[in-house]
């Protein structure tokens, strides 16, 4: 792992990767851009999946928070031979299937796509590839577009979030390169730190929230702070206010001293969530401290 | 061929627990989800939950929570699945299906023979 | 969760006729839609995938189709075998949810 920048964010990033025939000669170029954001992302409850599409989808290696299944998955992603078609909406499809299956008792992990495409989609293949993202961003997926050589950028715009989750690479596959950081950037979501990180027990706080990304959801008045406390219930809340690099939120009244509150963010008004190992803890405080 | 098989018919008091097992054959059973769905008498269908059978992880609907569990015994390849506080409206025949994946994924193919629950006092 | 309002809750009809089943979805849910036929005393069976596939196995004269909040199951002409109940289906997102069911007799 090369140093630099780093996400902490711990959410579901899944790779959608063109292996249609038009990539054939820029396999290489393709994994090592994947290789090195892969490792870019370093928090412990961060799991990625690496799906490939052509003629069909396949998932080639399933969610997985286990480094060494990643450094295997990588592996297997480097071995790939491309040729087929571009069923784009196929490698969506393989992710919505994992998202939904992610869905446990009402809770899901937020999910972040990563997807990648060096073609312009022809009509009908464009419609079923934005209607795939459709049902991927409703089961909660933020999606995101790498466009290399010969993509339709407005195409990519419809398919991704908005224009602004279109990352064009317009000098061809070497230049996959420099767009990490600008991706690594805008795709993570993390909660770095709350302060106060201790609050008084049955009193009212406010607490911020820092991180990063938090103005990355398509809509800022879906964004909610919420509270798992002591691993059973979560109680969410809507921030007073949302900036990039912080929230400032109501922290729900904890009654007993040693309470812990595990804080998580929700960019879609609590579809799915971003989980983080910041903990809030409740303490006695006496009159006048 | 893909075969589902449930246990027999079963009465049982209200407040008790019913237990009904699916046997799974013909097929890989860790590769497929199973989920559980069921009909009361002459009404519709109602999705119950899923199983994951490689991990054990589990889904059920709201309505279900806190009184279902579903659980796995890879080494039989059967899926079971557990109702508790049992109540005269939980009167009826229990399928498991099985998630026949990409590209049919959620559609439910094939189905158990069903599993008859008379809760009666 | 969503909701899936099938009509006609029941109809008549005979053999050799077109007979059309429809399903509103309380909000769009794409081609993820499936249909199924249940015989009495037994397990449903599965006629229709997204929206419009025919399950292998599955006679030609069921077709379906839509897309969005509406879909029909069509039964080109009635066969004596068809007289059954006939359920949708929606996965487009958690929970899973089911039409309450169209009953199909005999004239």
């Known amino acids: 792992e090369d140093g630099g920048p780093a996400c902490y964010g711990g959410f579901d990033l899944y790779f959608i990767l063109d292996k249609s025939g038009s990539v054939l000669h820029h396999w290489n170029e393709i994994y090592y851009f994947v290789e090195q954001l892969a490792h870019k992302f370093i928090s412990p409850q961060l799991r990625m999946s690496f799906i490939v599409f052509s003629t069909r989808g396949t998932t080639l290696m399933k969610l997985t928070e286990d480094r060494e299944q990643i450094r295997q998955g990588l592996e297997e992603l480097q071995k790939v031979l491309p040729g087929g078609d571009t069923y784009m909406h196929e490698g969506f499809e393989r992710a919505s299937e994992q998202i939904y299956y992610e869905n446990r008792q009402g809770y899901r992990t937020a999910s972040v796509i990563i997807a990648l495409t060096d073609g312009e989609l022809h009509e009908d293949l464009f419609f079923y590839s934005e209607r795939e993202a459709n049902r991927s961003r409703d089961l909660g997926a933020i999606v995101y577009c790498v466009g290399v050589k010969d993509f339709n950028e407005t195409q990519l715009a419809r398919i991704a979030d908005s224009k602004d989750h279109v990352f064009p690479v317009n000098d061809g596959f070497q230049a996959l390169q420099g767009i990490i950081h600008s991706i690594l950037k805008k795709s993570c979501i993390e909660i770095l730190a709350a302060e106060p990180s201790t609050i008084c027990a049955g009193e009212s706080f406010q607490v911020v929230v820092r991180g990063n990304g938090f103005r990355h959801a398509r809509n800022v008045d879906r964004v909610l702070c919420s509270f798992k406390i002591n691993d059973s219930v979560t109680l969410n809340e809507k921030p007073f206010s949302v900036e990039d690099t912080y929230l400032l939120c109501p922290a729900p009244i904890l009654k007993e001293v040693g309470m812990k509150a595990a804080l998580q963010v929700s960019m879609n008004d609590g579809l799915s969530f971003i989980s983080s190992s910041v903990i809030i803890t409740t303490t006695h405080c006496s009159d006048g401290s | 061929e893909v075969q589902l098989v449930e246990t027999g018919a079963e009465v049982k008091k209200p407040g008790a627990s019913v237990k009904v097992s699916c046997k799974a054959s013909?097929?890989?059973?860790?590769?497929?989800?199973m989920h559980w769905v069921r009909q009361a008498p002459g009404q519709g269908l109602e999705w119950m939950g899923w199983?994951?059978?490689?991990?054990?992880?589990?889904n059920y609907a709201q309505k279900f929570q806190g009184r279902v569990t579903m659980t796995r015994d890879t080494s039989i390849s059967t899926a079971y699945m557990e109702l508790s506080g049992l109540r005269s409206d939980d009167t009826a025949v229990y399928y498991c299906?099985?998630?026949?994946?990409?590209?049919?994924?959620?559609?439910?193919?094939?189905w158990g023979q069903g599993t008859l629950v008379t809760v009666s006092s | 969760d969503i909701q899936l309002t099938q009509s006609p809750s029941s109809l008549s009809a005979s053999v050799g006729d077109r007979v059309t089943i429809t399903c509103r979805a309380s909000?769009?849910?794409?081609?993820?839609l499936n249909w199924y036929q249940q015989k009495p005393g037994k397990a449903p069976k599965l006629l229709i995938y997204?929206?419009?596939s025919l399950q292998s196995g599955v006679s030609s004269r069921f077709s379906g189709s839509g897309s969005g909040t509406e879909f029909t199951l069509t039964i080109s002409s009635l066969q004596p075998e068809d007289f059954a109940t006939y359920f949708c289906?929606?996965?487009?997102?958690?929970?899973?949810?089911f039409g309450q069911g169209t009953r199909l007799e005999i004239k």
């Open positions: 289906q929606q996965t487009y997102s958690p929970p899973i949810t």
């Open positions: 997204a929206a419009s």
């Open positions: 299906v099985r998630d026949p994946g990409s590209p049919k994924w959620l559609a439910f193919d094939p």
């Open positions: 013909g097929y890989t059973f860790t590769g497929y989800y």
């Open positions: 909000r769009a849910i794409s081609r993820y």
């Open positions: 199983i994951n059978p490689t991990s054990g992880s589990t």
